[in-house]
Structure formats: C-alpha cells, structure tokens
C-alpha cells in the first residue's frame, strides 16, 4: 500500500523547547488508518485517523526534538481483505531545524 505524505505544519518551532506539529496523510482510499510517527527508528507517537479522514496531525510537546535523533518518518496501517493487517512503507523523511541565533 502506498507510503503516506508527511510535512511540518505551522506554527513552526523556533527553538528546541517549542512544540512540533507534523501532519501525516494516507492516500484517498485509506481513511481511518492507524498512524505511527517514528524518530531514530523508534516510535514517538501513535494516532488513529477518524473514519472519515485520511490523515492525522501529531503534536509533540516541547523538547521532543532532543531525542532520539534523526529525521521523522510516518507510516500507517490498515485492515485489508479478510481482516488482514497491512502496513504502508515509510514516508519520506522530515527534518526539524531551528533558526540560527543572530547574537
């Protein structure tokens, strides 16, 4: 099943203490999927989309950018034919960067 799309959504973090908002979207024919957000190979958060929606927005509290390292990816799972679980591939990576202080 196709990989989801992923993107940072406003307000964008300006420091490591700011919350991070990441939207993950499945293709149109997979509403109500279970979404996983990864960083550094491990799970950061799980969310299920409402049955009439194709995606979710992960809201990570301040400090989430500190560990584990690496870019964020998301993935979704659905129940396919005969109630068999299916998993998408990973999304493209999304990196979170912060403005360089001018002082």
């Amino acid at each position: 099943i196709p990989a989801p799309s992923i993107r940072l959504v406003p307000p964008y973090p300006s420091s490591q203490e700011d919350p991070i908002h990441i939207a993950c979207m499945a293709p149109g024919n997979f509403p109500g999927a279970n979404f996983t957000l990864y960083r550094g190979g491990q799970v950061v958060q799980l969310l299920q989309a409402p049955t009439d929606q194709r995606g979710v927005t992960f809201n990570l509290s301040g400090g989430s950018s500190k560990a584990p390292g690496g870019p964020f990816h998301c993935q979704y799972g659905v129940l396919g034919e005969l109630n068999q679980s299916q998993l998408s591939d990973l999304s493209e990576p999304v990196n979170v960067s912060f403005p360089v202080p001018t002082w």
């Epitope: 190979g41 491990q42 799972g77 679980s85 998993l87 591939d89 990973l90 990576p93």
Partner: antibody, heavy 117, light 116 residues
C-alpha cells in the same frame, strides 16, 4: 547493549506445534516493532512477520499466514512465535529481530527447529 | 521471476572495490524503494549494514564503516552496495531487502570472496 535470546527450538514431528520465545534486553522493548525471520540450511533469510509495539497490529508473510501466530508481552520484554501444523520445509534457524522503523537492525543468535518424523 | 535478484557470487582483491547489485523485477521501479543491506558470516545472524533510497534518504547502520555505501542504478533497475578498500573480514554473504506488497522480501544473496 541490545540483546535478543531465542529459545524453544528442537526436533518436532510433522503436524505438531511449537512455541518459540525471544527474550529482549538493553532497549525499551515496548517502543519497537519486532520480527521473526527464518533461514533454512544453506538458504537466504525469509521474513515471517512483524508485530507492532503495542501488539495490536501483526502482519504475516503469505507463506505462513494461518499457521504462525506472533505475539508479545511487553511487561516481560518477550516476543513469541506459535507454529502449528509444522512441515518438513519449516526446518530452519528461527531468529527474532528488533524493529528499526518497520525494518529490523539487530538479530538474535537464533534457535534451530528441525521438523522430522 | 524473483522480486529481487542478486548474483550468486563475486570475487575481488584486497584493497579493491566491490559492487554488489540487487536487481528488482521488471515492473517494480527501484526509484520508489528503500533498499536495505545485510552482511552474514558463517554461523552468525545477518548484520544490518545500511539502507538507501536516495542521497537525502539513507541511513548507515550503527558502527558500520563508511567504506560501505549504497546507491542505485536506475537504468538497470538495481540497488547497489559498494564496498571500497576491501578487507579479508568483508568475506561474507550479502543480502538485499525491500518492503514490497506489505512484506519484507530478501534477495537470494551474493557470496563475496576476498582473494588472496
């Protein structure tokens, strides 16, 4: 240090059942998907299935769906593989592997299962 | 036809480079896949080396030397594992792997021999 230790292998007759265990340590077990992979003598690895962190989502390879059941107990840091209706072609070394995203990076040393009458 | 095809064997000299290929079946576009590579030595489980999709989406395994690198050959519809500065300890079986149709699929493996 990440450690995975499989157990429960041995010689079993065709048609019988076997349950393998994988004891995990050195990482936050509940934050990672886990896999079972097998390797028949002289052959390449064959992926059997993945169970996600919370245990509610399991995906199996077509070749074993219906005969194998993967489960986990996060309170015991343990992964399980229940194998039913065993066949000669199930003879292999069975590895558990730690999830890396939904792939896997670290493997255990494996446990040998021999199906023979 | 297998999903992933690897040459059964490859030989190279110490200090040289070895290019191991993993060809995807016709109709499966290598550009859309992350290709994972594992090394296996006799009597040991496979060890994760790296994954490669593009230069902006790649990941080196923990402790894996930089002389192991991934790339793709779009014209051949293949993933490539490049090992530079070959050493005797690189002699092993190498497997590629992709996530295809909601399952992990391995190639048949390449046995790399380091001559001398």
């Amino acid at each position: 240090e990440v450690q995975l230790v499989e157990s429960g292998g041995g010689v079993v007759q065709p048609g019988r059942s076997l349950r393998l265990s994988c004891a995990a340590s050195g990482f936050t077990f509940s934050s990672f998907a886990m896999h079972w992979v097998r390797q028949a003598p002289g052959k390449g690895p064959e992926w059997l299935g993945i169970i996600l962190y919370e245990g509610g989502h399991v995906v199996y390879a077509d070749s074993v769906r219906g005969r194998l059941t993967i489960s986990r107990d996060n309170s015991k840091n343990t992964l399980y593989l229940q194998m039913d209706s065993l066949r000669d072609e199930d003879t292999a070394v069975y590895y558990c592997a730690k999830g890396f995203y939904h792939a896997f990076d670290v493997w255990g040393q494996g446990t040998m299962v021999t199906v023979s009458s | 036809q297998a999903v992933l095809t690897q040459p059964a064997s490859l030989s190279a000299s110490p200090g040289a480079s070895a290019s191991l290929t993993c060809t995807l079946r016709s109709g499966i576009n290598v550009g859309t896949y992350r290709i994972y590579w594992y090394q296996q030595k006799p009597g040991s489980p496979p060890q994760y080396l790296l994954r490669y999709k593009s230069d902006s989406d790649k990941q080196q395994g923990s402790g894996v030397p930089s002389r192991f690198s991934g790339s793709k050959d779009a014209s051949a519809n293949a993933g490539i594992l490049l090992i530079s500065g070959l050493q005797s300890e690189d002699e092993a079986d190498y497997y590629c792997m992709i996530w295809h149709s909601s399952a992990w699929v391995f190639g048949g493996g390449t046995q790399l021999t380091v001559l001398g």
